[in-house]
Amino acid sequence: VPLSRTVRCTCISISNQPVNPRSLEKLEIIPASQFCPRVEIIATMKKKGEKRCLNPESKAIKNLLKAVSKEMSKRSP
């Protein structure tokens, strides 16, 4: 049975380590839902397309989210 079909959350471990926004390919924020009761943040890295679950409560990750949203607001018209 593929795990993804039987489990509703995605993150097995979460990383508290800072992530350089420049090394990010993509940042997904999955809100809590009936399927998974917690917010999950999944960073896709440019290097080899590695995906890493980040700790939404970590100060470093909160700073990353601020930096990314700031960058996005700069880009949007």
């Epitope: 049975v1 795990l3 959350c9 995605t10 097995i12 471990s13 990383s15 080899k48 590695e50 995906k51």
Partner: antibody, heavy 124, light 108 residues
Framework: QVQLVESGGGVVQPGRSLRLSCAAS????????MHWVRQAPGKGLEWVAV????????YYADSVKGRFTISRDNSKNTLYLQMNSLRAEDTAVYYC?????????????????WGQGTTVTVSS | EIVLTQSPGTLSLSPGERATLSCRAS???????LAWYQQKPGQAPRLLIY???SRATGIPGRFSGSGSGTDFTLTISRLEPEDFAVYYC?????????FGQGTKLEIK
Amino acid sequence: QVQLVESGGGVVQPGRSLRLSCAASGFTFSSYGMHWVRQAPGKGLEWVAVIWFEGSIKYYADSVKGRFTISRDNSKNTLYLQMNSLRAEDTAVYYCAREGAGSSLYYYYGMDVWGQGTTVTVSS
Amino acid sequence: EIVLTQSPGTLSLSPGERATLSCRASQSVSSGHLAWYQQKPGQAPRLLIYGASSRATGIPGRFSGSGSGTDFTLTISRLEPEDFAVYYCQQYGSSPYTFGQGTKLEIK
């Protein structure tokens, strides 16, 4: 330093129970998925069970399903394996191991920290 | 369950030689879900490679992993005396996690 220390092993009769513990130190235990892996004498590695970082999701090998229960106490930085209805074939060294930081269903970072193991012998 | 078959069972080589260890899966495994471990007698396993080809922290550059789908390889470019051990591949593409039966790398 990052460390995992197993305890609770010993000699037990078939059908009896045993509880293994794994004390974690040197890292934020509550952020990591944790595993039990065993190794019978002279044999290879066999994965036993996994518990996700916050403790709500657990998986077991078919060989132990319904007999073994993995659990954790994040306030005590401790992982447990409750083993019931033990059989001779459960005789092994039991290792606890940490799932790599940020592992998910999409990408697996391996078991990056292991304890030294605790020996369980099931014999009459 | 996905069965991993490692070959050869035993590999006899001399220090300085190149070692190539194979791991074949009974079903396709995402490369992001394949790891390699080293185990020496009386010791716990040590993570070498994750994601099929990424070296774990502190692992020397002579160790490299490659492959995708059902065929994966661990290569040790130039054997050092401390590399003689048992090597296991392991998958996490589907539950349960499974290990290969191991390849023993011994001194010729």
